[in-house]
């Protein structure tokens, strides 16, 4: 007779996970040098005691806290690119300003972007079949509870100017309900953060309008200015051109504006 | 502005002590956790030790817990961690930093210790 299994809302845990975090890992200790001593079954031994044999709603920050230590990692704290609803495009800059870092180009984000995972309380089997969902079953999961601890102290460690990549193409360009909205900005360090810098990112070819006048821009604003840091605000009305520029600085039509 | 200075390093014969010490200013010091993060020759950085801001909780790695402590003085802004029984393996530039990582943006250059015989 086989076991009965709770069935959650959301998908199950990314298939091959754990060949896939220890693979990622490997990756990423290979390509950066200054991480070349983790110890990557010692970091995979971490991450999976953080769910395993736990309930799937009952995840805390301490569970994750072995795996923190692990990922001690140098992050120059002026040099933090934030983002909301336009992921690609902010690793597509990253990748080409390699002295700016996201979440997921340090190795924690970078082991754990875009998978799902949980577990089962009191076995030690991995629960390919169904996740919680954040909405509907619970907000404390092994998923949602990671990027909530590692989001916190990312903003934590940001000083400075910081920057924040948002989707101009959304109906709330600022959406007080995103990672960003609900973690980040409010553990930005009013005594290390001067400036937080929005980077609204436009869509449409011919969109000339100043989405920084957008009311969850001024929302933003808003809330940025009562925790007593500083806010400015850029259109990127040519996202692609933006990249182009970033790529070639001295190309005589990156003078003008993106 | 963050600004450390870290302190109180030498050259320990192994099973020794050494109090290490880190000066902070430009911040409201008791506002922030603390750690001791350290860089051994040729290899990455390592967490060590986290303090809360009013100093009632503490945290170590495990290759340091019963032998290291870790506190501070709110008063004078100053950050210790008190080494004993000192290995080899615990040869390494130690920062003090704020927060309690996993990412750190060390100010200081660091104290060097040196556990030989």
């Known amino acids: 007779v086989p076991r009965w299994r709770q069935q959650w809302s959301g998908p199950g845990t990314t298939k091959r996970f754990p060949e896939t975090v220890l693979a990622r890992c490997v990756k990423y200790t290979e390509i950066h040098p200054e991480m070349r001593h983790v110890d990557c079954q010692s970091v995979w031994d971490a991450f999976k005691g953080a769910f395993i044999s736990k309930h799937p709603c009952n995840i805390t920050e301490e569970d994750y806290q072995p795996l923190m230590k692990l990922g001690t990692q140098t992050v120059p704290c002026n040099k933090i690119l934030l983002w909301s609803r336009i992921k690609d495009l902010a690793h597509q800059f990253t990748q080409v300003q390699r002295d700016m870092f996201t979440l997921e180009d340090t190795l924690l984000g970078y082991l754990a972007d875009d998978l799902t995972w949980c577990g089962e309380f009191n076995t030690s089997k991995i629960n390919y079949q169904s996740c919680p969902d954040w909405r509907k079953d619970c907000s404390n999961n092994p998923v949602s509870v990671f990027w909530k601890t590692v989001s916190r102290r990312f903003a934590e460690a940001a000083c400075d100017v910081v920057h924040v990549m948002l989707n101009g193409s959304r109906s709330k360009i600022f959406d007080k309900n995103s990672t960003f909205g609900s973690v980040e900005v409010h553990n930005l360090q009013p005594e290390k953060v001067q400036t937080l810098e929005a980077w609204v990112i436009h869509g449409g070819r011919e969109d000339s309008r100043d989405l920084c006048q957008d009311p969850t821009i001024k929302e933003l604003e808003s809330i940025i200015s009562k925790r007593n840091i500083q806010f400015s605000c850029k259109n990127i009305y040519r996202p692609d051109k933006f990249l182009q520029c970033v790529k070639n600085p001295e190309d005589s039509s990156c003078t003008s504006e993106i | 502005e963050v600004q450390v200075l870290e302190s109180g390093g030498g050259l320990v014969q192994p099973g020794g002590s050494l109090r290490l010490s880190c000066a902070a200013s430009?911040?409201?010091?008791?506002?922030?956790?603390m750690s001791w993060v350290r860089q051994a020759p040729g290899k990455g950085l390592e967490w060590v030790s986290a303090?809360?801001?009013?100093?009632?909780?503490?945290d170590y790695a495990d290759s340091v817990k019963g032998r290291f402590t870790i506190s501070r003085d709110n008063s004078n802004n100053t950050l210790y961690l008190q080494m004993n029984s000192l290995r080899a393996e615990d040869t390494a530039v130690y920062y003090c930093?704020?927060?309690?990582?996993?990412?750190?943006?060390?100010r200081g250059q660091g104290t060097l210790v040196t556990v030989s015989s």
């Open positions: 303090i809360s801001g009013s100093g009632g909780s503490t």
């Open positions: 930093a704020d927060g309690t990582g996993p990412f750190f943006d060390y």
């Open positions: 430009g911040f409201t010091f008791s506002n922030f956790a």
